[in-house]
């Protein structure tokens, strides 16, 4: 297996309520094959925010073309941010399997939400 790193360059991001938040994530390799998922929080209670291969996430849009065969940019944009979205978001690489196996997580990006400017 090649060494793979998941890089979340920003430790924190601050966004005004009602705006969109961009959470950056890149992988250094596509191997081993398997999906990327985004979570808020850690542990068994973590919340799935985006799954590369399945699910409906109406507020989440990939920043780069996810259908590119050589895509290693797994950044996402979350629209219409509210205070309830605050938290630490993790970009996690999985290796294919039944079920998929968690391989490596980014360091996390803390999203804070500012009050809407009046």
């Amino acid at each position: 297996e090649e060494e793979l790193q998941v890089i979340q360059p920003e430790k924190s991001v601050s966004v005004a309520a009602g705006e969109s938040a961009t959470l950056n994530c890149t992988a250094t390799s596509l191997i081993p094959v398997g999906p990327i998922q985004w979570f808020r929080g850690v542990g068994p209670g973590r919340e799935l925010i985006y799954h590369q291969k399945e699910g409906h996430f109406p507020r989440v849009t990939p920043v780069s073309d996810p259908t590119k065969r050589n895509n290693m940019d797994f950044s996402i944009r979350i629209s219409n941010i509210t205070p309830a979205d605050a938290g630490t978001y993790y970009c996690v690489k999985f290796r294919k399997g039944s079920p998929d196996v968690e391989l490596k997580s980014g360091a996390g990006t803390e999203l804070s939400v500012r009050a809407k400017p009046s």
Epitope: E1, I31, N70
Partner: antibody, heavy 117, light 108 residues
Amino acid sequence: DVQLVESGGGVVRPGESLRLSCAVSGFRFSSYAMSWVRQAPGKGLEWVSGISSGGDTYYVDSVKGRFTISRDNSKNTLYLQVNSLTAEDTAIYYCARETWNHLFDYWGLGTLVTVSS
Amino acid sequence: SYELTQPPSVSVSPGQTARITCSGGDYYSTYYAWYQQKPGQAPVTVIHSDDKRPSDIPERFSGSSSGTTVTLTISGVQAEDEADYYCGGYDGRTYINTFGGGTKLTVL
């Protein structure tokens, strides 16, 4: 229902060109990568070319420089321009929708290209 | 790139279990699928992502992988399952799709 309908095949002479089309319906075409796969008479399947939703293109070595894949998301149509055709290009050409990991989940019925002098 | 190798033919009696193998890819860099093709028809995907069955495919079709070999299993084979079956792979190193040579399944 997902539907893929190819057209544009025919009989041509060696060195000539064709443009194959694949009209799709039943899903959001602009969100999916697509591919062309061909099958020579009595032979197996051969992947020819793929294109991402944003237009990045990929080809098998044997057709690089001769074939060009493209798409028009506003027309829900996939294309394959095939130039400098040889007898070895004689095949049924299928368009196929790609899964998130570049396998295929839906296929068209195919269009036959025959190259003969 | 790599080659995917399948047996040219497999024969099975109705109601029995058919297993078709495919070898040659690198497990860590390759996703696999199985495509069914009946004479004069277009291929139909019966398994993708190694073991995922499309919703309209009967449950008797299943996929599995072990090391560099993937297997299509058809439990309780029916006469209508007689077809050519192609193993397909997508290689994340080369960005290329590859197919095996196909296996003719005969239902005796």
